[in-house]
């Protein structure tokens, strides 16, 4: 079957069946704003959701990909890297019927999609177009190519404290 691999580099194909270990991000900025306890002493800022030692923020406002990236950076976070099945299911459970920018961009010179931590995305991005170099999730079960200049919602993520 097709499963996520364990090397934190997005999606891959393996020959044997298996389960997937929990994989966490490596950056650890401190949350800002009002802190609320979430689980076993870990905390996320107000309006952020806790999952597997990470905090996630889903915007209701919309902006371009660059503005979204900067918004997340300003909150001590990054656009979400959706590289485990656990994280994918969690995000499908909490995203409204809207499109959300994530941290996945097309590198035209390489002709490949990469997460913003530079790891390779080995899945398939739908709706590809020569002018669509950013990606969204939500609304559908797929990773959809999108214009980086169109305004969509965003998902930010960072380590829980």
């Amino acid at each position: 079957p097709q499963i996520f691999n364990k090397s934190n580099d997005g999606f891959t194909t393996t020959r044997s069946y298996g389960t997937v270990s929990q994989i966490f991000g490596s950056s650890s900025p401190s949350p800002n704003g009002f802190i609320t306890t979430r689980s076993y002493g870990t905390v996320c800022p107000k309006d952020w959701e806790f999952y597997q030692a990470r905090c996630f923020f889903l915007s209701t406002s919309e902006s371009s990909w660059n503005e979204s990236r900067d918004f997340c950076k300003g909150k001590g976070s990054t656009l979400a890297i959706v590289n485990t099945p656990e994280k994918l299911k969690f995000l499908q459970d909490i995203t409204d019927a809207e499109k959300y920018f994530i941290g996945l961009i097309y590198h035209r010179e390489e002709k490949r999609w990469r997460w913003i931590n530079n790891s390779v995305f080995n899945g398939n991005v739908t709706n590809q177009n020569q002018n669509f170099n950013c990606a969204t999730i939500g609304l559908t079960k797929t990773f959809d190519a999108a214009s980086c200049d169109i305004s969509y919602r965003r998902i930010c993520e960072k380590n829980a404290k």
């Epitope: 079957p1 097709q2 499963i3 891959t12 209701t60 019927a97 899945g123 398939n124 739908t126 797929t142």
Partner: antibody, heavy 116, light 113 residues
Amino acid sequence: QVQLQQSGAELVRPGTSVKISCKASGYGFNNYWLGWVKQRPGHGLEWIGDIYPGSGNTYYNENFKGRATLTADKSSTTAYMQVSSLTSEDSAVYFCARGKESFAYWGQGTLVTVSA
Amino acid sequence: DIVMTQSPSSLALSVGQKVTMSCKSSQSLFNFSNRNNYLAWYHQKPGQSPKLLMYFASTRESGVPDRFIGSGSGTDFTLTISSVQAEDLADYFCQQHFTTPYTFGGGTKLEIK
């Protein structure tokens, strides 16, 4: 911890309607899809629909469209399902469950009996 | 609608034995974009609500013992219990979460000898 507490059993007449509640606690109610599932002995489990409380967006199984109505009250973190024009086929246990497509947390179920 | 078919409808085993149950879907549950199979497994103990065991065919829900193993792809899926325990007495349901309406199999009743 995540909890979904459903309202008690209902005995209702054919042709009438019933409204079941599901009180959520232990998580951000507005930010998670909440589904409803019907279980009849010998008929297995049947997905009715789901709601995103933050926006009120809903999806329905065509089999229940027009008869089932899903709503959510953000202030009380309670979701509701109303089913109208009840028949004996609607006698079942109804569950609320958190999630968009697969469900990790379930209410304890509400038994609805439709009888004259 | 996608039809889910489970087999066998019931089985009885002794504690420690290996259990295998099947679930077949009327169309592929494989998502080409994210490379996951949208198939979940639940068990439901007598008088209780269903409990999620597995999603994406092979990803164990948090807290589920590792004796539960999900496998398969496309239309054919299997839930294996490597060494059945007395507390595993339950009805087991598969569910496709690929497209609406999400549909469930008829269930496999596991009895302990």
